[in-house]
């Protein structure tokens, strides 16, 4: 046998632990890339889509949501993996049989062209050049994200 | 305290396969994802893959697709892998390593290792 | 594929040096490197993360910086115990890969 066995220093403060954050954010915490006024944090191991809602939101953020195919190509320029996927914040309504957010809107159909069915139990990915219906229980990566709150210039009354 | 026990080492033919185990304690076994890594004799280390222990969810390094299986069983708090159609370049030391976070690609803790012997 | 290259591949040194490791990336990993320590006999031991994070538990010589292509891990007075194999490691891409490690040998 090659190894003795041994114990593991870890750290006390668990990173999968809620963390508390001041509201309103102006720059992006360690670890996750800026994109415009939004922080992304890609996953490193893989989760059905729930699973993946649910871990975003230890980190106080959500499944990433896509306003126009222009944020969607720029999120798809930080992806260096090719055949890798990742869940978004977005699936199938059946009861309103559409395309719904997480945030409650509905897909405007011209902003992503998406591969594959939509039906129930289906979830959105995205890779480095598309975007896929997939069953919801299928294992992948995901992106969280947060917004970034505006800096506003304090107006101050006359003295 | 976190520990990741390895069983112990194996001598197989070329052709044949190997399972290894890792017995994980100290934590939440389905709270951190188990990853693989081996080390050929004097070489350096090579990622094999992951398994979610919570899902089962597996990804893996493409040089391995077709040879590795990775399970787990959160009833013993183990995780498994098994590399089939051993050939003699398969002979090197095996690791199981937790992912330390979710959203990095670090490992926190290692097992002990188990040689893996694979010659005729 | 990211390869990563570390140099001196050996290194003599006597209690008390100051010694340095390279470790130098084929594309940009931003500061997603990982230093691992290993000795003789042992698995191997993190020891910095996110380039320059020490990890818990890991004394202050320990240092390590760098971002991009080249990243270094330094011991600032080496001891005794810190003759092993150091090794880096990549992750910003899924395929993680390491360096062919640095071992560090009393002179």
């Known amino acids: 046998q090659k190894s003795s066995i041994e114990k593991c220093s870890v750290d006390i403060q668990q990173s999968r632990n809620k963390t508390t954050e001041r509201p309103g954010l102006l720059n992006c915490p360690i670890y996750w890339q800026q994109l415009r006024e939004k922080c992304l944090l890609f996953s490193h191991t893989v989760n059905p889509w729930n699973n993946s809602l649910a871990d975003c939101s230890t980190k106080e953020s959500s499944l990433l949501l896509i306003r126009d195919k222009d944020e969607l190509i720029h999120t798809q320029n930080l992806i260096r993996d090719k055949a890798i996927l990742f869940w978004i914040g977005l699936n199938f309504s059946l009861s309103e049989k559409n395309w719904k957010w997480i945030n409650g809107s509905f897909l405007n159909s011209n902003d992503l062209e998406i591969r594959g069915d939509a039906k129930e139990n289906s979830c959105i990915s995205i890779s480095q050049t598309s975007v896929y219906s997939e069953y919801c229980s299928t294992e992948i990566r995901w992106i969280c994200q947060k917004e970034l709150t505006p800096v506003r210039n304090k107006v101050y009354p006359d003295s | 305290q976190v520990q990741l026990v390895q069983s112990g080492a194996e001598v197989k033919k070329p052709g044949a396969s190997v399972k290894v185990s890792c017995k994980a304690s100290?934590?939440?076994?389905?709270?951190?994802?188990m990853n693989w890594v081996r080390q050929a004799p004097g070489q350096g280390l090579e990622w094999m893959g992951l398994?979610?222990?919570?899902?089962?969810?597996?990804y893996y390094n493409q040089k391995f697709k077709d040879r590795v299986t990775m399970t787990r069983d959160t009833s013993i708090s183990t995780a498994y892998m098994e590399l089939s159609r051993l050939r003699s370049d398969d002979t090197a030391v095996y690791y199981c390593?937790?992912?330390?976070?979710?959203?990095?690609?670090?490992?926190?803790?290692w097992g002990q290792g188990t040689t893996v012997t694979v010659s005729s | 594929d990211i390869q990563l290259t570390q140099s001196p591949s050996f290194l003599s040194a006597s209690v008390g040096d100051r010694v340095t490791i390279t470790c130098k990336a084929s594309?940009?990993?931003?500061?997603?490197v990982v230093w691992y320590q290993q000795t003789p006999g042992k698995a191997p031991k993190l020891l910095i993360d996110?380039?320059?994070i020490r990890h818990t538990g890991v004394p202050d010589r320990f240092s390590g910086s760098g971002s991009g292509t080249e990243f270094t891990l330094t011991i600032s007075s080496l001891q005794p115990e810190d003759f092993a194999d150091y090794f880096c490691?990549?992750?910003?891409?899924?395929?993680?890969?390491f360096g062919g490690g640095t071992k560090l040998e009393i002179k």
């Open positions: 390593a937790r992912l330390g976070d979710n959203y990095r690609g670090y490992f926190d803790c």
């Open positions: 100290g934590y939440s076994f389905t709270g951190y994802t």
């Open positions: 398994i979610n222990p919570n899902t089962g969810g597996t």
């Open positions: 594309q940009d990993v931003g500061t997603a």
């Open positions: 996110w380039a320059s």
């Open positions: 490691q990549q992750y910003s891409t899924y395929l993680y890969t």
